[in-house]
C-alpha cells in the first residue's frame, strides 16, 4: 500500500467565489474516497466535480475533487480522504499560502 499525497489549492472563480481543488496523488491501490466537507458534512455530489482516477506512469494513481465556495467561508470546508483504511482531512489554504 502506498498512501496518497494530498494537496489543496484555491483559484479565483466568479465574483465572490473561489474554486478549491483537492488532489490526491501517488497512491496504490486505486480505490480511494475523496470528497469535500462543509462543517464535517459531505457536500452533495452535484456540487462537486471529480477527476478520473488515472495511472501516473509510476505504478501509482491520482485523482482530484473540486468545488466552488464563497470567498471568506474557506475555514468551513475540508477535503476528506480515505484510502486503505486510513483517513485524513485537509483544510483550504489561506489566501497568502
Amino acid at each position: 500500500t502506498v498512501p496518497p499525497m494530498v494537496n489543496v489549492t484555491r483559484s479565483n472563480a466568479s465574483e465572490g467565489n473561489i474554486t478549491v481543488t483537492c488532489r490526491a496523488s501517488s497512491f496504490y491501490p486505486r480505490n480511494i474516497i475523496l470528497t469535500w466537507r462543509q462543517d464535517n458534512v459531505s457536500l452533495s455530489n452535484d456540487t462537486q466535480q471529480w477527476g478520473d482516477v488515472l495511472p501516473d506512469g509510476n505504478g501509482t494513481y491520482q485523482t482530484w475533487v473540486a468545488t466552488r465556495i464563497c470567498r471568506g467561508e474557506e475555514q468551513n470546508f475540508t477535503c476528506y480522504m480515505e484510502h486503505s483504511g486510513n483517513h485524513s482531512t485537509h483544510p483550504v489554504p489561506s489566501n497568502g499560502s
Epitope: 488532489r23 496523488s25 486505486r30 477527476g51 478520473d52 495511472p55 501516473d56 506512469g57 491520482q62 482530484w64
Partner: antibody, heavy 122, light 112 residues
Framework: QGQMQQSGAELVKPGASVKLSCKTS????????ISWLKQKPGQSLEWIAW????????SYNQKFRDKAQLTVDTSSRTAYMQLSSLTTEDSAIYYC???????????????WGRGTLVTVSA | DVLMTQTPLSLPVSLGDQASISCRSS???????????LEWYLQKPGQSPKLLIY???NRFSGVPDRFSGSGSGTDFTLKISRVEAEDLGVYYC?????????FGGGTKVEIK
C-alpha cells in the same frame, strides 16, 4: 487552450536517431498527460506513448518500447520524443497531443500540435 | 490489442444529409476506473486531428450540436444530423481504455 509548438521537419539517415520537441505555452504544463502519435501518409493514427508532465511517469505502446523514449523538461515546458535506430518504416508525421488532467474534458487528445514530418532516407 | 473497426470506409453524402459512422471494438472498452474512453476525431487534409466527442457521448467545447455520439459495450456510433461543407474529412474512432490505445481505420466523408 494554449499552444503546442512542434519542431521542424527532419530528414535523417537509416540507423540514426532524432529528437522531436513539443514546446508548450498557455496552460499549466505539469497538469498534463502528453501523448505522441504516428501517422503515415494516407493511413490511420498510432498511439506511441504518454508521459505525465507532473511526475515524468509514462506508459508505452509495446510496439514502440524500443523505438521511442519520452522525456519532459518542466523548466522549458517542453516534451521530447527520441526515436532511435531509424528505418524507412519510421517515416511519418509525428504529433504531440495533450490531456489536461485538471480540465473538464476526459479526452486523451484534446489539443494537438501541428505535427513533425520525419523522413528516413539514405 | 483492441481492434477498432470502422464502417463504412467511405461515406458519400449530400450537404444537409444525416451521416452515421459505426465503430466496433474487439472487446469491451471500459477502463478500470469505470469510464469508457471512446473518442471521435475529425482530420481534414493537411491538418492535425480535432477532438469531437469524448467518453462516448460528450461533445468537446466548441463542437456543434449536430454531432452526437452514442453506444455501449462494443458498438459505438457517431451521427452528424445535417452535414455541412466543413464536416468533410476523415473521421477516426479511438479507445483509450486499454493499453495500447488504438484507433479505427478511418471513415472518409465526402461529397456524393
Amino acid at each position: 487552450q494554449g499552444q503546442m509548438q512542434q519542431s521542424g521537419a527532419e530528414l535523417v539517415k537509416p540507423g540514426a536517431s532524432v529528437k522531436l520537441s513539443c514546446k508548450t505555452s498557455g496552460f499549466t504544463f505539469s497538469d498534463n498527460y502528453i501523448s505522441w502519435l504516428k501517422q503515415k501518409p494516407g493511413q490511420s493514427l498510432e498511439w506511441i506513448a504518454w508521459i505525465y508532465a507532473g511526475t515524468g511517469g509514462s506508459s508505452y505502446n509495446q510496439k514502440f518500447r524500443d523505438k521511442a523514449q519520452l522525456t519532459v523538461d518542466t523548466s522549458s515546458r517542453t516534451a521530447y520524443m527520441q526515436l532511435s535506430s531509424l528505418t524507412t518504416e519510421d517515416s511519418a508525421i509525428y504529433y504531440c497531443a495533450r490531456h489536461d488532467y485538471y480540465g473538464t474534458s476526459g479526452a486523451w487528445f484534446a489539443y494537438w500540435g501541428r505535427g513533425t514530418l520525419v523522413t528516413v532516407s539514405a | 490489442d483492441v481492434l477498432m473497426t470502422q464502417t463504412p470506409l467511405s461515406l458519400p453524402v449530400s450537404l444537409g444529409d444525416q451521416a452515421s459512422i459505426s465503430c466496433r471494438s474487439s472487446q469491451h472498452i471500459v477502463h478500470s476506473n469505470e469510464n469508457t474512453y471512446l473518442e471521435w476525431y475529425l482530420q481534414k487534409p493537411g491538418q492535425s486531428p480535432k477532438l469531437l466527442i469524448y467518453k462516448v457521448s460528450n461533445r468537446f467545447s466548441g463542437v456543434p450540436d449536430r454531432f452526437s455520439g452514442s453506444g455501449s459495450g462494443t458498438d459505438f456510433t457517431l451521427k452528424i444530423s445535417r452535414v455541412e461543407a466543413e464536416d468533410l474529412g476523415v473521421y477516426y474512432c479511438f479507445q483509450g481504455s486499454h493499453v495500447p490505445w488504438t484507433f479505427g481505420g478511418g471513415t472518409k466523408v465526402e461529397i456524393k
